[in-house]
């Protein structure tokens, strides 16, 4: 045992660069940290066989394997990864320690599995055994958290049933609307999945994971706030657990809180009372309602009432599937240069939407805002005047939705010319699309003002960059305009652009361009 | 370097819920299989083991303390928690936290690095 | 369960003596055996692991052996840094359990 070497096996994570194949290498690239392996004798092998902790890196990523070896004299060593043999370069590092390294870039199924070391020390040999998966990421969920009632106790636990499974964490706030952004003072985080702080103004609780983070808002009817003008709205699937809670302050303890579903008291078990004195001996009241898994006929008008309060009512519906209404009529847009401008969709789901907005193939972030109608908006204004297709996509466990819009960026035409031997060719993007005017400069008209109108062929949109039209015209060449030089103008209401081009023989050509506003 | 560094409150009153940390650095909860325990030991006394989680996201709990025990990991943060709640004098000891490899061919080399510890007492 | 009975509670040895450490599981734990030192105010330092096999680092003068039930752990000659509390581990399977350990002090 005295004469086996001191081994460290580490692993090092790069930031992706573009390459191909496992390779060893001395020299890897600049890279995060090393992480320790835990390299250990691994017991009962034939042989010396060292062993690091299993390795599980993303699709693509680019990692390095690395023994550091503390022995005596030189070492030789040799990789072997699915039955081939890889070249191996050690090399001493400060420390005066033998360094043997694995590259493996762009991480691929087929570079996923053993790799083997075998090193030759002056005292000993030895193996050392590296284990390389791909996490997979497609058994990955993350679902929206819910509430349950800590038995015994006037608390609430949150539920998300997510894999890895999730850090759960309650988001609270006691400001009113803008201040309860998430990054506001005003909020406060607690992580941990029993809450026993259920006076608060804004409860959410956020489950998140490698997916991502989801929250859920407890649905709250405060009878000292002004009513919203729209009845406030619940949406849950059957099956789904329904929590409401009603909130209500007095200078007093004399006020009784009660819960009617349709004019009928809500049935013993299905709602729970608390109480507290705030820090200026007001008393507050919440009296939750509650239905562990609700059926159809719990939809209804839920009406919280307090004896020293005007009533409140939410309306809950329940759905047998999931929905998101929007309408998905495709929407075309004429906006200037610099006009401030974004994209809206107005809509109502449940489940909450997942969302993107698309331009070019690219993807941006989507936010969604709440309104007090029930409706959501989402908001698109990164467009960075460029026309073209914008796309809304929208999905939720049960339903998806695509919204099509179309920018046009009103402007004045930018002529574009090219010729060959039998035809020349001009094209323009500008917005409205342009008309075409063909002109003949000679001597008898040196300002170009002979109008051609033989051989002239338009077309409004003979190409689609990212749905931007761009408008083309074609001059047929004949004998009569040979040799000359012909204009080629396109106008709307915005302007005039000119290219002026020479008709000889095939060939690169001299233009001119002209702009006329 | 590898460390596990234990966090949490000193001092916690009876019926109280404990909560530690258990932030680790110098090898990855994400990229590398490693599970992590915690134990604790009280003054003058052995070590007592009291819960696990596996790179899996698998844990596993004492018998005697499973209902009053929650362990969880943020791989995020590089930290693995621990709940144990209903706080009595007897739970007075040093926590340590604790890392195990986990070996692709299945055996298990125990615990190779452990935190330095963090002293909590409970007392009203 | 598994219970581990570690035997002696307490051993006064001196320096350059041969000490042995015994641990016994309730049931078998096939070689799934740690060793761990631990010094006051200190955390438990690993020594053995897999019943024989020796921690990188640590002095060859330690050592271990046993398969099954049965497990001991032999200091060849005792160096004055020895002398510490000593646990035994079964890290066979869940839930894991620790020795109630040996007290190593100096006669």
């Known amino acids: 045992n005295q004469d086996l070497p001191v081994i460290k096996c580490v692993l090092i994570n790069h930031k992706n660069n573009d390459s191909s194949v496992g390779k060893s290498s001395s020299y890897p690239m600049v890279s995060e940290s090393p992480e320790d392996l835990g390299c250990a004798l691994r017991p009962q092998s034939s042989g010396t066989v060292y062993e690091a902790a299993a390795v599980e890196v993303d699709v693509s990523a680019s990692i390095t394997l690395q023994v550091l070896v503390d022995a005596p004299g030189n070492i030789s060593c040799l990789w072997v990864f699915k039955h081939s043999s890889l070249n191996c370069q050690p090399h001493f590092d400060l420390q005066n320690r033998g360094v043997v390294s694995m590259v493996i870039l762009k991480m691929t199924e087929t570079q996923a599995g053993e790799y083997l070391l075998f090193i030759q020390s002056e005292a000993t040999n030895y193996t050392i055994l590296f284990t390389v998966s791909i996490r997979n990421t497609l058994l990955y969920t993350l679902r929206r958290p819910y509430f349950r009632k800590m038995e015994n106790q006037d608390a609430l636990v949150c539920i998300s049933e997510s894999v890895p499974e999730p850090i759960v964490e309650w988001v609270l706030c006691d400001s009113q609307g803008e201040s309860c952004k998430e990054e506001s003072p005003a909020v406060v985080k607690k992580e941990e999945k029993v809450l026993h702080e259920l006076f608060g103004t804004d409860i959410r609780c956020c489950a998140r994971n490698e997916l991502g983070r989801e929250c859920t808002r407890l649905f709250t009817i405060d009878l000292n706030q002004t009513p919203q003008t729209t009845l406030p709205q619940l949406f849950l699937k059957v099956g789904e657990p329904l929590w409401i809670r009603c909130k209500a302050v007095h200078v007093n303890h004399g006020f009784g809180l009660t819960w009617e579903l349709e004019n009928k008291a809500l049935e013993e078990g299905n709602y729970f009372e608390m109480s507290t004195y705030s820090t200026n001996r007001t008393m507050i009241r919440i009296l939750f309602a509650f239905v562990s898994s609700v059926a159809r006929n719990d939809t209804g008008y839920y009406t919280c009432s307090s004896s020293k309060h005007p009533s409140q009512s939410a309306l809950v519906t329940i759905v047998e599937k999931g929905f998101i209404n929007a309408t998905n009529s495709s929407e075309d847009y004429e906006i200037d240069q610099y006009e401030e401008f974004c994209f809206s969709v107005r809509f109502k789901a449940y489940p909450q939407i997942r969302c993107t907005w698309t331009f070019s193939r690219k993807s941006f972030p989507c936010e969604q805002k709440g309104l007090d109608n029930g409706y959501s908006i989402s908001k698109f204004c990164n467009h960075k005047h460029q026309p073209g297709e914008y796309i809304f996509h929208a999905e939720n466990d049960d339903a998806q939705f695509t919204k099509m819009f179309t920018l046009n960026i009103r402007r004045k035409p930018q002529v574009l010319a090219e010729a060959s031997a039998s035809q020349a060719s001009c094209f323009s993007d500008g917005y409205p699309l342009p008309s075409w005017t063909w002109k003949k400069c000679s001597d008898k008209s040196p300002n170009c003002t002979e109008e051609i109108t033989e051989g002239v062929w338009n077309r409004k949109a003979n190409r689609k960059v990212f749905g931007q039209w761009v408008s083309s015209s074609t001059l047929n060449m004949s004998e009569a305009i040979k040799g000359f030089l012909v204009k080629c103008c396109a106008y709307n209401s915005l302007g005039t652009s000119c290219e002026t081009i020479l008709l000889n023989s095939p060939g690169p050509f001299p233009f001119i361009q002209d702009n006329i506003s | 370097q590898v460390t596990l560094k234990e966090s949490g409150p000193v001092l916690v009153k009876p019926t109280e819920t404990l909560t530690l940390t258990c932030t680790v650095s110098?090898?990855?909860?994400?990229?590398?299989?490693?599970?992590v325990s915690w134990i604790r030991q009280p003054p003058g006394k052995a070590l007592e083991w009291l819960a696990h989680i596996f790179s899996n996201d698998e844990k596993s709990y004492s018998t005697s303390l499973k209902s009053r025990l929650t362990i969880s990991k943020d791989t995020s943060k590089s930290q693995v928690v621990l709940t144990l709640t209903n706080m009595d004098p007897v739970d007075t000891a040093t926590y340590f936290c604790a890392r195990m490899p986990e070996y692709s061919s299945g055996w298990s080399g125990a615990f190779d690095i452990w935190g330095q510890g963090t002293m909590v007492t409970v007392s009203s | 369960d598994i219970q581990m009975t570690q035997s002696p509670s307490s051993l006064s040895a001196s320096v350059g003596d041969r000490v042995t450490i015994t641990c016994r599981a309730s049931?078998?734990?096939?070689?799934?055996l740690a060793w761990y030192q631990q010094k006051p105010g200190k955390a438990p330092k690993r020594l053995i692991y897999a019943a024989s096999s020796l921690q990188s680092g640590v002095p060859s003068r330690f050592s271990g052996s046993g398969s099954g039930t049965e497990f001991t752990l032999t200091i060849s000659s005792l160096q004055p840094e020895d002398f510490a509390t000593y646990y035994c581990l079964q890290h066979n399977s869940f839930p894991l359990t620790f020795g109630g350990g040996t007290k190593l002090e100096i006669k």
């Open positions: 110098g090898f990855s909860l994400r990229n590398i299989k490693m599970g």
């Open positions: 049931q078998d734990i096939s070689n799934y």
